[in-house]
Each structure stands twice: as C-alpha cells, then as structure tokens.
C-alpha cells in the first residue's frame, strides 16, 4: 500500500481543516488508514482523524482543530496499521479556504432595486470576519448566456443592483462566495443558490410612450 498523491490540506481558519490524498489502488480509507495530526510543541498526544473514501483510491479527512493562530504548524502522519506511509506538515494560515457564506436572500420589495443579502460565515472574533470580500453570481434559468459576476469589495455582506439591468418577467438565480486577500486564500465554495422572479416594470411614462409608438405601427 502506497500513497500515489500526497495529502494536501486546506483550513477554514476556524475549526476544520480538510486533507485529501490518493492511494495507489482501491482503499477502504476508514478501516485501513489513520491520519495523526499534532501542533508543533503541543505536549498532548496527537489527534487522530479517521478518513472517508473520496472515489475509489481517494481519501479525505476532516481535522478538528481549535481556533487557528497564524503561526500554527501541524505535523501530519499517515498510518496504515503500524506502517508509516507519509509524514509531512501543514500550516493552516498558508492554506485557507474560507467557509461559504450562507442565508442568501433576494429582497424584491423595492420596485426598481434588488437587494441581495447574505451572512458572513465567521463569528466577529475570528480574524477573517472583517477581511472577507465576495463575488455574487447571478444567472438566468432561461438563458445560459445571461450570466454575470458582481465583485463586492466592501465588508458589508450585501449587494444592490437595479432591477432594470436584468430581463423582466423571467426567473433568476444567485449564489455568493468569499475570499480573503490578507491570507491570499482560495475562493470558498458557492453558497446554496436562491431563486426569484424578476417582475420589474418600467415607469409609467416609458410604458405609455412604448404603447403609443406600438399603436401607430
């Protein structure tokens, strides 16, 4: 039994780091392997992660951690019974993948403006709480070409857009993801998408002129 692709890990900079690797053949990860992890200089015993299968030869392990400190460095040991298959280290602050934002809501009660809000996935005492920026993806269910990304570079988890920038009378979906420049993170996963019907109506005067013009034809 050998490791084909060495473990690579990402941290949510809060309580979980996820490590993935591939073996050289089909493996029952949870019964055959153990990933031991320990903070450098920690005087307690190493913690054990029981991996799960991630495809035939792939394994994934979710390492439970305490609040991350930027200098934290973990030793990682991958064991198959009494055989040490791989030894490495992992510094969570250098491999951050933020948690996905949640509770994405589209407020359509203001006739000419769409307000999208979502929740910051971190508690206020976490360092990333005040360092996330977002990308909002809006797309039409009817037209695959109608696909747009809005970059939200301010801290407030919200986005206002004019309803008139979207086509009227059709359904749209939106989703949001996050990243933090301070730790040069990867993007988070996308949030679950939310759907709404864009029922924007042009102002009365535009409607009136439009109909009048149409009538003459």
């Amino acid at each position: 039994m050998k490791v084909l692709q060495e473990p690579t890990c990402v941290s949510d900079y809060m309580s979980i780091s996820t490590c993935e690797w591939k073996m050289n053949g089909p493996t029952n990860c949870s019964t055959e392997l153990r990933l031991l992890y320990q903070l450098v200089f920690l005087l307690s015993e190493a913690h054990t992660c029981i991996p799960e299968n991630n495809g035939g030869a792939g394994c994934v392990c979710h390492l439970l951690m305490d609040d991350v400190v930027s200098a934290d460095n973990y030793t990682l040991d991958l064991w198959a019974g009494q055989q040490l298959l791989w030894k490495g280290s992992f510094k969570p602050s250098e491999h951050v993948k933020p948690r996905a934002p949640g509770n994405l809501t589209v407020h359509t009660n203001v006739s000419d403006t769409l307000l999208l809000t979502w929740s910051n996935p971190y508690p206020p005492d976490n360092y990333l709480y005040n360092h996330l920026t977002y990308a909002v993806n809006i797309w039409s269910e009817n037209d695959p070409a109608d696909f747009r990304i809005y970059n939200v570079t301010y801290l407030e988890p919200s986005l206002r857009i004019a309803a008139s920038t979207l086509k009227s009378g059709i359904s749209y979906r939106a989703r949001v993801r996050a990243w933090a420049q301070c730790y040069n993170t990867t993007w988070s996963e996308w949030s679950p998408s939310t759907k709404w019907h864009n029922s924007y109506r042009e102002p009365f005067e535009q409607h009136h002129h439009h109909h009048h013009h149409h009538h003459h034809h």
Epitope: L42, L43, S44, E45, D125
Partner: antibody, heavy 119, light 108 residues
C-alpha cells in the same frame, strides 16, 4: 471530575532531595502533557518542568536544569518531580498542572504542596 | 527567553467597575497567550487561551484581546468574586513558557 492531588512536600535542608507526586484522576492521564509550576511566597508563577503524554520529551528552565527531573507513570496515573541539590530559593508551593487539549495553556491545577528548603 | 511585562502590578477598583490589565511581550507571540486568576491560598484558575477564547465555565464579563506583543484582559463589570491576582502566560515556541509577574485587583 478532573482532580490533581500533590504530595511529598515538606522541610528539607539545603543540598537535600525530595520527590513530589501528583495523583491524577477523572481524565485519561496518558493522553495529556503535564507540568510542574512553582510559586515562592508572595511571588509569581514559574514553570519548572514539562513532560509530554508518553514521557518521551521533557523540558526545564536553566534555574533547575540538571537538578530537577520530571517523570510520569501512566499505568499509575501519577506525575513525579525529583528535586536534588535543593537551595533556599527553591522554597515554594509546587503545583502540578495539566496542559489543555489543544493548547499549551494549563487548564487544571492541583492544590499545591509546600516545599521549604532551610537549615 | 521571552519576557512578559504585566501592568499595572496592582489596582484598586469597586464592584461594577470596568477593569483592564495589560500584558506586553518582548517578541511576537501571535495569539499564544493565556490568562489565569488566582485567589489567596488557592491554585490558579484557567480563564482565557489563544488571547481571546474563554475557557469553559468562565463568565462572559471576562474578555481577552490583542495579538503580537500587546494583550489585554478586561473585566466589564467587576464582581466581588473577581478580586484576585491575574497572570498572563505565553506558550509560543519550545516549552520555556513564562508568566507575567501578576496584577493584584484589590477592593477600593
């Protein structure tokens, strides 16, 4: 309930020896790092020895290095501190403490045992 | 070794007061800092770790902040049982971890 109970303190002459014990209960002793911390009368806290969970790694400050030895018997759930060549400045209350699961802060402490070095 | 400087060494305060104790380190320790409370004749009690995370069972009137070299312990509304001596301790790097000299919080 986590409990740490120190014993073995007392009066000893300068140059003498003493062995302190700390009986642990209420947790899986063999999976925790442990330490001895002392406090001289009216003074602050000083870390004097640390040991990892299996006893394979120990550490001491220069002030006690070569004179003090920390050890543990995981089968007996007991931590020890062997103190040799004692000096008057070693007079203090000695606490045993457990290291917190995720960090090297000390989450549980014993009630302490007084060591007096005097002629 | 990393030096720890606590201030003030003592302070007088009344029940209900907001109390702030600071701890400064001689080099960057990131957030590897703990706070303890000790009452006369008793063992120290674990209050805070990672500079800001409350230990289990510690009242929310206690809070910690800071990172790098400057740290603060705050008691938002001092209670009668809070009169004690408070110590900071760093746990950065190899186990030569040191404590601050302590801050005694007395009744005014």
């Amino acid at each position: 309930e986590v409990q740490l109970v120190e014993s073995g303190g007392g009066l000893v002459q300068p140059g003498g020896s003493l062995r302190l014990s700390c009986a642990a209960s209420g947790f899986t002793f063999s999976t925790y790092g442990m330490s001895w911390v002392r406090q001289a009368p009216g003074k602050g806290l000083v870390l004097v020895a640390t040991i990892n969970s299996n006893g394979g790694s120990t550490s001491y400050p220069d002030s006690v290095k070569g004179r003090f030895t920390i050890s543990r018997d995981n089968a007996k759930n007991t931590l020890y501190l062997q103190m040799n060549s004692l000096r008057a400045e070693d007079t203090a209350v000695y606490y045993c403490a457990r290291f917190f699961r995720f960090r090297n802060a000390m989450d549980y402490w014993g009630q302490g045992t007084l060591v007096t070095v005097s002629s | 070794d990393i030096q720890m400087t606590q201030s003030p060494s003592s302070l007088s305060a009344s029940v209900g007061d907001r109390v702030t104790i600071t701890c400064r380190t001689s080099e960057n320790i990131y957030s590897y800092l703990a706070w303890y409370q000790q009452k006369p004749g008793k063992a120290p009690k674990f209050l805070i770790y990672n500079a800001k995370t409350l230990a289990e069972g510690v009242p929310s009137r206690f809070s910690g902040s800071g990172s790098g070299t400057d740290f603060t312990l705050t008691i938002s509304s001092l209670q009668p049982e809070d009169f004690a001596t408070y110590y900071c301790q760093h746990y950065y790097g190899p186990p030569t971890w040191t404590f601050g000299q302590g801050t005694k919080v007395e009744i005014k």
